[in-house]
């Protein structure tokens, strides 16, 4: 059974490939069963992740879960790296998995890898 | 409660193609990897690959890469894997499953009935 | 790949007996998050494969107590304390750790 413990849906060693200059959505699927918790992201740096603190971030309702998004408008080529998302709830910190934003640079856009081929990296 | 339906069987001749098919309900598959597995008759497991379906990345073992196509319709909850070239060797039973690694040790994995695929002419 | 070998190819045990399967892997499967993804699976006769463990000592819901896994880096071990006839079937160890994910070559469970 699922418990009402405060769950981050991020998959483990997940991929986005993305273009440089285009708007992006990074999503960090929450369930929660009451209260909604406090949401932040993190890029991580090393074995650091660290807090990114003044960035554009909304959340999105929907039936059964919610999404904390953080917002790149537009996408940079140093916004290349992993993010986590982490959740504080009754005083525990839930921490995701990272998830991984390969950035093509606009200039090389024509040499664009395919997804699979990002996929394998 | 999740469950993962496969068609039951599936005859084809040598040199041609087959797509199985895998549907989910009971869990959005978005929110989830999906894997397929070979069980040759009598032997053992062999991980063919798996998708994201929120994205469309894939990753396969390298033996079966060329010869498997893994896709998602989030829409209808299915994954699919499309099996080219068929020979003998093809013959097997083909297991999807679904895999989540989440946060707060919620970790679960579930398993098709599998396609028994024949390959004879 | 990483190679993924279990010992013994079948094990015959009577009823109400232990029985323990190992299961060692050609390189750690300690990965970066300090997690050990490490399954262990039981294909009964006829049906799919059905996860019993997960992260190499976590027991999935349903799963009954008389199961324990452990062991670490490369090195693990599914014991059975008192084995019922329900357990009958092929045992396999899976790790999720490296690309691509792999199996063992399963061991085999009888009822003597």
């Known amino acids: 059974k699922e418990s009402c413990d405060v769950q981050l849906y991020i998959k483990r060693q997940s991929e986005h490939s993305i273009l440089a200059g285009d708007p992006f959505e990074l999503e960090c699927p929450v369930k929660y069963c009451a209260n909604r918790p406090h949401v932040t992201w993190c890029k991580l740096n090393g074995t650091t992740c660290v807090k990114l603190e003044d960035r554009q971030t909304s959340w999105k309702e929907e039936k059964n879960i919610s999404f904390f998004i953080l917002h790149f408008e537009p996408v940079l080529p140093n916004d290349n790296g992993s993010y986590r998302c982490s959740a504080n709830f009754q005083s525990n910190l839930i921490e995701s998995h990272s998830t991984t934003l390969y950035v093509t640079d606009v200039k090389s856009a024509s040499e664009r890898p395919s997804k699979d081929e990002m996929a394998s990296r | 409660e999740v469950q993962l339906q496969q068609s039951v069987a599936e005859l084809v001749r040598p040199g041609a193609s087959v797509k199985l098919s895998c549907t989910a309900s009971?869990?959005?598959?978005?929110?989830?990897?999906m894997h397929w597995v070979k069980q040759r008759p009598e032997q053992g497991l062999e991980w063919i690959g798996r998708i994201d379906p929120a994205n469309g990345n894939t990753k396969y073992a390298p033996k079966f890469q060329g010869k498997a196509t893994i896709t998602a319709d989030t829409s209808s909850n299915t994954a699919y894997l499309q099996l080219s070239s068929l020979t003998s060797e093809d013959t097997a039973i083909y297991y999807c499953?679904?895999?989540?690694?989440?946060?707060?040790?919620?970790?679960?994995?579930?398993w098709g009935q599998g396609t028994t695929l024949t390959v004879s002419s | 790949d990483v190679v993924m070998t279990q010992t013994p190819l079948t094990l015959s045990v009577t009823i109400g007996q232990p029985a323990s399967i190992s299961c060692k892997s050609s390189?750690?499967?300690?990965?970066?998050?300090?997690?050990?993804?490490l399954n262990w699976l039981l294909q009964r006769p006829g049906q799919s494969p059905k996860r019993l463990i997960y992260l190499v000592s976590k027991l999935d819901s349903g799963v009954p107590d008389r199961f324990t896994g452990s062991g670490s880096g490369t090195d693990f071990t599914l014991k059975i304390s008192r084995v019922e006839a329900e357990d009958l079937g092929v045992y396999y160890c899976w790790q999720g750790t490296h690309f691509p994910q792999t199996f063992g070559g399963g061991t085999k469970l009888e009822i003597k």
């Open positions: 499953a679904l895999t989540y690694y989440g946060s707060s040790q919620y970790y679960f994995d579930y």
């Open positions: 009971g869990f959005n598959i978005k929110n989830t990897y």
């Open positions: 390189q750690s499967l300690l990965d970066s998050d300090g997690k050990t993804y």
